[in-house]
Interface confidence: medium
């Protein structure tokens, strides 16, 4: 395209400015530019927009419906990592904080109207994860760190006085209310990045207009990594119904039985008093907040397609390169979805030796080319092996049996699960499905760890029998609903350690 020469740029310095070409003049037509911020491990990228004005459709219905000129922001490499958001018009994107290591912006302009463009600044901030970190941080509904644009709902009450943006815990002006009270309605929060969700605090609201109180007495929780594939949180086989508020002002805290790894959260009221009104806080942490828990590049695209391989593959659409956590809508399917246990494997070459401390495993959705039915598959149990040279392999061992450890996998095709283990030195990591869903084997993956220099494995860890302590549920066995007055704090913080 005519305007695109030399408009793409990589940013590696500790801070900088990213601007549309020609800024502060109007941007040129026919641009396709990519701006990529690359951060070293343990660095968080903070991106703040100062000026934002792109052409938009005056009839545009929702945010992200950009027809003419737009800026896409990606968690990772463009079109590989997940899309955080598509922006146009004059509504300035709110501050973004990424700990994935790569944040990319792609700027597209058409051949017609040009506006003033954008100017943004970024900072790289050092983050040193704490060894005893507790995963119970308020995620930002009350503080505002979760921006208004991240909060939405199935519908909003017609008078404009009960919007999703009024659903912040302790907000002093009403709360969120749907157009009509029904258990089909929901309040949705986009956390933008994959986040560990460990607890939810809710309040009702008292109408400023009528002084009447409304509150949600119970709700269901739904989660999604992409905003399209949703899972209702379950307790055992049944949908979990959380007991919520008993009046319009008290805060009730519900801790999850085990953390959920998700990006999108929906609260779906089931019963209510007089009408639905909701104020909310979410608690949890980022995966990367734990020590040596960087995402090593499957999600972001830092690991190239050529570094992902498998024992077999069904066809191109569901090849190993589709096995990227979250960012792939499909996933890897082996040639025979119902293989023999331990026969199939998915392998990641990390490029250089790393300290590996865990994997995030996710199911997959894809097609069965014979029946043309979309399969929603996941792996229920798996083993992990690792190698420094690609030839000599070791399984992660179960310290009790001295046999290869059988890890718990997924229970749903979209919801990812983290499985951690003692640090291992590895350049190559293989996951072997052992048991799977009725739809067969389907998998997406991320590897967690850090540079070898950051966390040198001990001599003991390097030995042939690797000690492994898989923390599946270091949580209370039952969810608890707790009334917690003005300030929600976790009385027993050890309940909510990272898995």
């Amino acid at each position: 395209k005519t305007g695109s020469e030399d408009c793409s740029k990589n940013f590696t310095s500790p801070n900088g400015t990213i601007e549309s070409p020609g800024f502060p003049e109007k941007y040129p037509h026919n641009l396709d530019c990519t701006f990529t911020i690359l951060a070293k491990p343990k660095m968080e990228i903070i991106l703040q927009f100062l000026i934002f004005d792109l052409e938009h459709d005056p009839l545009q219905v929702g945010e992200g419906d950009c027809k003419y000129d737009w800026l896409d922001i990606w968690d990772g490499i463009p079109h590989v990592g997940p899309l955080i958001g598509k922006y146009c018009g004059t509504k300035t994107p709110s501050e973004l904080r990424s700990s994935t290591g790569i944040l990319s912006l792609t700027f597209h302009t058409d051949m017609a109207v040009a506006k003033d463009g954008f100017s943004a600044r970024y900072y790289l901030v050092h983050q040193e994860p704490l060894e005893n970190f507790q995963c119970n941080v308020p995620l930002g509904m009350e503080s505002g760190r979760i921006a208004n644009e991240q909060i939405s709902a199935s519908s909003t009450y017609s008078d404009g006085r009960w919007t999703p943006q009024q659903s912040r815990l302790h907000g002093d002006d009403n709360g969120w209310t749907p157009n009509l009270d029904s258990n089909k309605e929901y309040l949705q929060v986009d956390l933008r990045f994959l986040t560990m969700l460990t607890a939810i605090a809710t309040q009702g609201a008292i109408s400023r207009e009528t002084q009447n109180g409304y509150y949600v007495k119970s709700y269901k929780l739904e989660v999604s990594t992409n905003g399209e594939d949703w899972m209702v949180y379950r307790h055992g086989k049944n949908h979990k119904v959380f007991q919520a508020n008993n009046d319009a002002t008290e805060v009730v805290l519900n801790k999850l039985h085990a953390p959920l790894l998700t990006r999108f959260v929906r609260i779906r009221p089931q019963t209510w008093h007089s009408g639905i009104a909701l104020r909310l806080e979410l608690f949890g942490c980022r995966v990367t907040d734990a020590p040596c828990s960087n995402m090593l590049g499957m999600l972001s695209g830092l690991i190239a397609d050529s570094q992902i391989s498998a024992s077999s593959t069904q066809e191109y659409l569901w090849s190993p390169s589709a096995a990227r956590l979250v960012s792939s809508r499909s996933g890897w399917f082996p040639r025979i979805p119902q293989a023999q246990p331990g026969e199939e494997w998915l392998q990641v070459d990390l490029g250089t030796p790393k300290t590996v401390k865990g994997v995030i495993i996710q199911g997959a959705r894809g097609g069965d080319s014979i029946t043309a039915v979309e399969a929603r598959a996941f792996v229920r149990k798996f083993k992990v092996s690792y190698s420094l040279n690609g030839k000599d392999w070791e399984y992660i061992q179960d310290p009790r049996t001295q046999q290869p450890k059988l890890f718990e996998g997924n229970m749903h095709y979209d919801t990812p699960d983290i499985r951690r283990f003692d640090p291992i030195p590895a350049q190559y990591v293989r996951v072997y499905p052992e048991r799977w869903s009725p739809a067969g084997i389907g998998m997406r993956l991320e590897v967690l760890g850090c540079d070898w220099t950051d966390s040198k494995p001990t001599v003991e860890t390097l030995g042939p029998t690797v000690k492994s302590e898989e923390t599946t549920t270091p949580y209370p066995t039952e969810e608890e609903a707790t009334e917690c007055g003005e300030n929600c704090s976790f009385e027993d913080d050890k309940d909510l350690q990272l898995p």
Partner: antibody, heavy 121, light 108 residues
Framework: EVQLVQSGAEVKKPGATVKISCKVS????????VHWVQQAPGKGLEWMGR????????KYAPKFQGRVTITADTSTDTAYMELSSLRSEDTAVYYC??????????????WGQGTLVTVSS | DIQMTQSPSSLSASVGDRVTITCTAS???????LHWYQQKPGKAPKLLIY???NLASGVPSRFSGSGSGTDFTLTISSLQPEDFATYYC?????????FGGGTKVEIK
């Protein structure tokens, strides 16, 4: 089916107290407000007050404050309106009403049949 | 309190006539909080229109509502014999809720 059934007509002397009942069925009384509305003969509708049955929280119109008491008994799904120190101008039909589907704006989709109270010496 | 003033207080019309009743609030009322009721002699009021323009269940489409701010209107496009009744507007935008004085629609 939602129904509000009120107690029968009453004749009271000035200075007396009247207590009218409103039995609801077809929905959980604890989850909604019950309002009371007065209509004097040949006159319009006047809101008297309401109760949040869940926690017995009440609100009254300034005109009736101090003379009206609204209560509820969840065991029988019944709301009550008591008006004291009756005077002749309290002669009216009294309605209970509930805004089940429009609690926020309080449009009254369901009404009792009304109870006529006559205050006469 | 928000005062609701209806006009006219009564009107005479024939079957088939188009009838318009207005309701004026003493201060602005959000359209979500303005409703209309119909009441026949000896009966309880019946919800006719809620949120300014939404017909309650079972209400014929000849009834319609409109307005915003302080001025609201109830229209009956073609008056039918069963429509002869008293009509009340009602706000609950501010507590206490208040009703208009009523408009009696009589047969000419």
């Amino acid at each position: 089916e939602v129904q509000l059934v009120q107690s029968g007509a009453e004749v009271k002397k000035p200075g007396a107290t009247v207590k009218i009942s409103c039995k609801v069925s077809g929905f959980n009384i604890k989850d909604y407000y019950v309002h009371w509305v007065q209509q004097a003969p040949g006159k319009g509708l006047e809101w008297m007050g309401r109760i949040d049955v869940h926690d017995d929280e009440t609100k009254y119109a300034p005109k009736f404050q101090g003379r009206v008491t609204i209560t509820a008994d969840t065991s029988t799904d019944t709301a009550y309106m008591e008006l004291s120190s009756l005077r002749s101008e309290d002669t009216a039909v009294y309605y209970c009403a509930t805004p089940i589907y429009g609690a926020r704006e309080a449009w009254f989709a369901y009404w009792g049949q009304g109870t006529l109270v006559t205050v006469s010496s | 309190d928000i005062q609701m003033t209806q006009s006219p207080s009564s009107l005479s019309a024939s079957v088939g006539d188009r009838v318009t009743i207005t309701c004026t609030a003493s201060s602005s009322v959000s359209s979500s909080y303005l409703h209309w009721y119909q009441q026949k002699p000896g009966k309880a009021p019946k919800l006719l229109i809620y949120r300014t323009s939404n017909l309650a269940s079972g209400v014929p489409s000849r009834f319609s509502g409109s307005g915003s701010g302080t001025d609201f209107t109830l229209t009956i496009s073609s008056l039918q014999p069963e429509d002869f009744a008293t009509y009340y507007c009602h706000q609950y935008y501010r507590s206490p809720p208040t009703f208009g004085g009523g408009t009696k629609v009589e047969i000419k």
